[in-house]
Amino acid sequence: TLNSVLINSNAIKNLPPPLGGAGGQPGSAVSVAPGVLYEGGNKYQTLDNYQPYPCAEDEECGSDEYCSSPSRGAAGVGGVQICLACRKRRKRCMRHAMCCPGNYCKNGICMPSDHSHFPRGEIEESIIENLGNDHNAAAGDGYPRRTTLTSKIYHTKGQEGSVCLRSSDCAAGLCCARHFWSKICKPVLKEGQVCTKHKRKGSHGLEIFQRCYCGEGLACRIQKDHHQASNSSRLHTCQRH
């Protein structure tokens, strides 16, 4: 139900519930143990059996997905929206999020966003913001400072806790994940850390936090000593392939 919220954050790691909360729509932004679904009252259960990721916006989808009506490319076209696979290079697009990581939407086509090959003045404003990291600050003289475009752009990738638009904005070892009404860079999960196994059956639309994915060489699997537990309480952790 959309009145449920899945708390699922790198930030929280293995805290006992609760961290405290405040109201949210849909549902209440209640901070409970990671990977636990709050359904009002005292009822907690994990989410592992929903149909394809329902979503309302791109940030609820994975880094290789965007939110859209399944029959049309653009989000916001009537009916239910789900997370769809990103568009590869040279495919049609309407916004940056539709293009796969490493690409951006230019003139309705997904183009490679090789930071060192942007011609002067060619990058759209939102890309300039990302590359210049200007979304992280106000200038010292009290006025915001825009990044000046040169033919080569060198920038610092977002560190943990930095606001981001997609994972390519974040430094190595971090991904861009939903955090309440924003997205921030969070650590890619290490071996043994709790992860979220969505099984392509959706819960992104209910998350107010997202965890990152498991790091290289790791997969999100049921923790061995939890095999005997009921389906609704299986704990997934990042494990070696």
Epitope: L15, L19, G20, P26, A56, H135, E160, W181, S182, I208
Partner: antibody, heavy 115, light 108 residues
Framework: QVQLVESGGGLVQPGGSLRLSCAAS????????MTWVRQAPGKGLEWVSG????????YYADSVKGRFTISRDNSKNTLYLQMNSLRAEDTAVYYC????????WGQGTLVTVSS | DIVLTQSPATLSLSPGERATLSCRAS???????LAWYQQKPGQAPRLLIY???NRATGVPARFSGSGSGTDFTLTISSLEPEDFAVYYC?????????FGQGTKVEIK
């Protein structure tokens, strides 16, 4: 450059309503979550509400839940805060700010609730 | 709610001196989801530090943030006349977002 300009503040009686607006420019508005923060005269900062880039997700402080409604019109690059059932303790300067740590702030608009 | 306690409430220093402001969280933040702001009278706050230690664009290098867990620090290495203001910390780990009560840095 990024600019946020609030408007709509003023004097209102207890129980009354006001609608604050925040006009945004200089950035891709729908890419960013937005936040309202308030500051009572001579006091510290208090988070009021937040809204995701598309407007699909909203969050409120307990002190305003059920009375205030945050919304946005991405076609107009404008953020709103509808304030109903106002109380004396809602008297404050209200700031709109971008994202969850507030990287850009408006100049603020004063809301005075008094009879 | 996570309570942030800033100390001292007031710091009286001279230009050129080093200022060390503390922000203590009532719960372990585990992650560096802490920001620092500067506010001058009659003005909106201004972001200085985010992610506990990342300096916001355009913020002078004399400002630095550090700390983790429950204890965070904002350091101004050598105070300039324009640095005398109120400083707030804010956590964005969990809701409600909370701010410290502020530290006023005043001229001695």
């Amino acid at each position: 450059q990024v600019q946020l300009v609030e408007s709509g503040g003023g004097l209102v009686q207890p129980g009354g309503s006001l609608r604050l607006s925040c006009a945004a420019s200089g950035f891709t508005f729908n890419n960013y979550g937005m936040t309202w923060v308030r500051q009572a005269p001579g006091k510290g900062l208090e988070w009021v509400s937040g809204i995701s880039g598309s407007g699909s997700y909203t969050y409120y402080a307990d002190s305003v839940k059920g009375r205030f409604t945050i919304s946005r019109d991405n076609s107009k690059n404008t953020l709103y805060l509808q304030m109903n059932s106002l109380r004396a303790e809602d008297t404050a300067v209200y700031y709109c700010a971008r994202t969850i740590y507030m990287d850009y702030w408006g100049q603020g608009t004063l809301v005075t609730v008094s009879s | 709610d996570i309570v942030l306690t800033q100390s001292p409430a007031t710091l009286s220093l001279s230009p050129g001196e080093r200022a060390t402001l503390s922000c203590r969280a009532s719960q372990n933040l585990f992650s560096p989801y802490l920001a620092w702001y500067q506010q001058k009278p009659g003005q909106a706050p201004r972001l200085l530090i985010y992610g506990a230690s990342n300096r916001a664009t355009g913020v002078p290098a004399r400002f630095s943030g550090s700390g983790s867990g429950t204890d965070f620090t904002l350091t101004i290495s050598s105070l300039e006349p324009e640095d005398f203001a109120v400083y707030y910390c804010q956590q964005y780990l969990t809701l409600p977002l909370t701010f410290g009560q502020g530290t006023k840095v005043e001229i001695k």
